[in-house]
């Protein structure tokens, strides 16, 4: 019965960009201005999303697809389909309820969004710190301290990198 009913349902013939109009004996009517239906067989058209305030229009609404928003400069999208805009901070900062705050010692953030994360603990992998961390950058772990002791390895150390712009003496 369900299959028979769907075959006889006049609404199933209504294409995207239209809706099945109950006020007109279920004929397919084009979506009114500033509304859309992205699939066939719809009984209503959805109101177009409006990108206002901190949101800006990335893609205009059409009768068959909704508008898409992103955020104005200085903000970034959060949530599915950019449902919210959140303020950017600088690298080395995180957004708190009181605004952008520098990362605490021992943490870093290399992006304009997100939270400060702890530096990598090199010793957990048995390695040593090769380059210290900053608010903007994680530490760089190097060989283990044992590898650095004299005679611990027969591997030839790499040649020091030349600074750009200097020719060999």
């Amino acid at each position: 019965f369900e299959r028979t009913r769907s075959l006889q349902d006049p609404c199933s013939n209504c294409p995207a960009g239209t809706f099945c109009d109950n006020n007109r004996n279920q004929i397919c009517s084009p979506c009114p201005p500033n509304s859309f239906s992205s699939a066939g067989g719809q009984r209503t058209c959805d109101i177009c999303r409006q990108c206002k305030g901190v949101f800006r229009t990335r893609k205009e609404c059409s009768s068959t697809s909704n508008a898409e928003c992103d955020c104005t400069p200085g903000f970034h999208c959060l949530g599915a389909g950019c449902s919210m805009c959140e303020q950017d901070c600088k690298q080395g900062q995180e957004l708190t309820k009181k605004g952008c705050k520098d990362c605490c010692f021992g943490t870093f953030n290399d992006q304009k969004r997100g939270i400060c994360r702890p530096w990598t603990n090199c010793s957990l992998d048995g390695k040593s710190v090769l380059v210290n961390g900053t608010k903007e950058r994680d530490v760089v772990c190097g060989p283990s301290p044992a590898d650095l002791s004299p005679g611990a390895s027969s591997v030839t150390p790499p040649a020091p990198a030349r600074e750009p712009g200097h020719s060999p003496q």
Epitope: G17, P30, C31, S62
Partner: nanobody, 111 residues
Amino acid sequence: AVQLVESGGGLVQSGGSLRLSCAASGNISSLHVIAWYRQGPGKQRELVAWIAWDDIAHYVDSAKGRFAIWRDNTKKTTYLQMNSLKLEDTDVYYCNSGDSWGQGTQVTVSS
């Protein structure tokens, strides 16, 4: 209210062409949606082609590749060019915008 008047229907041989016109008078918004429907005796009106509020032309599957809809805003007229007509295209064709309907124009395709 908007008044719509269709013209251009008639008798044409299978494979032939017709151009229907829909002249609008009254207060028409620049975003107005205009559509062509067809209706046979004892049947429901069926959408054929329409110009959406975003000014994009759309067609039902049976009209794709054969029919073309466009409008001339200076003349407040919308056209439906019907090519490669088939016997099953025989119907009364109506122009519609919002709650306004034209009186219809008969299209008859003969073999």
